[in-house]
Amino acid sequence: PGPPAGSPRVSSDPRADLDSAVLLTRSLLADTRQLAAQMRDKFPADGDHSLDSLPTLAMSAGTLGSLQLPGVLTRLRVDLMSYLRHVQWLRRAGGPSLKTLEPELGALQARLERLLRRLQLLMSRLALPQAAPDQPVIPLGPPASAWGSIRAAHAILGGLHLTLDWAVRGLLLLKTRL
C-alpha cells in the first residue's frame, strides 16, 4: 500500500527530484525577472535599493565550486522563506501604489510557496534536516511612505532575482555531480 500518509516517499532518483527543483527555480526566476521589469517600467528606480531585513546574498564568485547539496538546499529554503515573508508583507502593507501589481505579486507568492514545498520534499527525500532560520526574524513594520514601499519592492524583487540566479547555478552544477 506504500508508505503511511505524511511520511516522505523514498525517491529512487535524486537527480530527477533535483531536476524538478531546478526547473521550478528557473520558472520562478522568469516570473521574478518579469515582475522586476514591470516595477521598473511603472516606478523607475533611482539606483540600487536595499532592505536591512532581507537575507544577505548567499554567494560570491568563489563559492560555486565548493558547494554541497545539503548546504545549498538549506540556505535556499531559509532565504526563500524570508522572501516569502517579504512578499506577503508587500501585498499587505504596500499601499495603493502597489495595488496595481497585486495579481502579479499574488502569483509570485503562490510560486514561491510551491518551490518551498518542493524543496522541503526534496530535503526529506534526501534525509536532510529541515533547518530553522539561524537569524532572528525581524518584524516588518509598515513602510514609511508610498515611495518607501516602492523602494522596498525594488529591493525585494532585486534580491530574490539574485538569490534565484545563484540557486539555479548551484543546483545545475550539483546535478552534474550527482
Epitope: 531536476d19 526547473l23 521550478l24 528557473r26 520558472s27 526566476l29 522568469a30 525577472r33 546574498l57 554567494m59 560570491s60 564568485a61 568563489g62 563559492t63 560555486l64 539574485l162 540566479d165 545563484w166 539555479v168 547555478r169 545545475l172 552544477l173 546535478k175 552534474t176
Partner: antibody
Framework: EVQLVQSGAEVKKPGASVKISCKAS????????MDWVKQAPGQRLEWIGD????????IYNQKFTGRATLTVDKSASTAYMELSSLRSEDTAVYYC????????????WGQGTTVTVSS | DIVLTQSPASLALSPGERATLSCRAS??????????IHWYQQKPGQAPRLLIY???NLESGVPARFSGSGSGTDFTLTISSLEEEDFATYYC?????????FGQGTKLEIK
C-alpha cells in the same frame, strides 16, 4: 541601441593564453548574464559558460572547465573570457552573447572575435 | 549532454516557397510549461541572430513569416514564404539543462 562590441582578432602560439573583451551598451549591464559561445570552422556552436555581472559565480561547460575563465568589470560594463593552454583546435570565432538563466536563450550577440592558434 | 539533430543538413528552395526545418532532441526538452528550444539564423561572416525563443515565441523585430512549433523532442521552424534575405544557416539550441547545446545547422540555399 543594445550592443555588444568585442575586441579584435588574435593570433596565438600553442600553450599561450588569450583574453577577449566584450563591452556592453544600451542596456543595464547587471540585468542580464553574459554567455560565451565558440564556433570552430565546420563545427556546431558550442556554449562555453555564463557569468552573472552582479555576483560573478560563473558556470562552465565541463569541456572548458579549468581552461576558460569568465570575469566581469561592472564599472566598465565589460565581460572577459580568458582561454589558457591554447591548442590548434581552439582556432575559432568566439562570441559573447546576452542571456539569462530562466530561459537561457541569447538575444544579443557580439560581432565575434577570431582566435587563430598556430605555431 | 542533450544532442540536437537538425534535418535536412541542407535545403534548396526558391523565393516564395515554404521552408520547413526540423530539430530533434535526444531527450525531452519540454517541462514545467516551457519548451526550452530556440532558433537562430546565421549569415556568413555574421553572428547568429535569435528568431524564435521557447519553441514558438517570435523575437522582437523578426518578420511574421517565421514561426516555431513542437514539444517534447520534435521541433519545427517554418518560413511561410521565403525572401532573398532568408537564405542562411539555421541553428536550434536547447536550454533544458547544463550545458545548453546547439544543433549542427540546416543550410538554406537558393535553388
Amino acid at each position: 541601441e543594445v550592443q555588444l562590441v568585442q575586441s579584435g582578432a588574435e593570433v596565438k602560439k600553442p600553450g599561450a593564453s588569450v583574453k577577449i573583451s566584450c563591452k556592453a551598451s544600451g542596456y543595464i549591464f547587471r540585468d542580464y548574464n553574459m554567455d560565451w559561445v565558440k564556433q570552430a570552422p565546420g563545427q556546431r556552436l558550442e556554449w562555453i559558460g555564463d557569468i552573472n555581472p552582479t555576483i560573478g559565480a560563473p558556470i562552465y561547460n565541463q569541456k572548458f572547465t579549468g581552461r576558460a575563465t569568465l570575469t566581469v568589470d561592472k564599472s566598465a560594463s565589460t565581460a572577459y573570457m580568458e582561454l589558457s593552454s591554447l591548442r590548434s583546435e581552439d582556432t575559432a570565432v568566439y562570441y559573447c552573447a546576452r542571456g539569462e538563466l530562466a530561459h537561457w536563450y541569447f538575444d544579443v550577440w557580439g560581432q565575434g572575435t577570431t582566435v587563430t592558434v598556430s605555431s | 549532454d542533450i544532442v540536437l539533430t537538425q534535418s535536412p543538413a541542407s535545403l534548396a528552395l526558391s523565393p516564395g516557397e515554404r521552408a520547413t526545418l526540423s530539430c530533434r532532441a535526444s531527450k525531452s526538452v519540454s517541462t514545467e510549461g516551457y519548451s526550452y528550444i530556440h532558433w537562430y539564423q546565421q549569415k556568413p561572416g555574421q553572428a547568429p541572430r535569435l528568431l524564435i525563443y521557447l519553441a514558438s515565441n517570435l523575437e522582437s523585430g523578426v518578420p511574421a513569416r517565421f514561426s516555431g512549433s513542437g514539444s517534447g523532442t520534435d521541433f519545427t521552424l517554418t518560413i511561410s514564404s521565403l525572401e532573398e534575405e532568408d537564405f542562411a544557416t539555421y541553428y536550434c539550441q536547447h536550454s533544458r539543462d547544463l550545458p545548453p547545446t546547439f544543433g549542427q545547422g540546416t543550410k538554406l540555399e537558393i535553388k
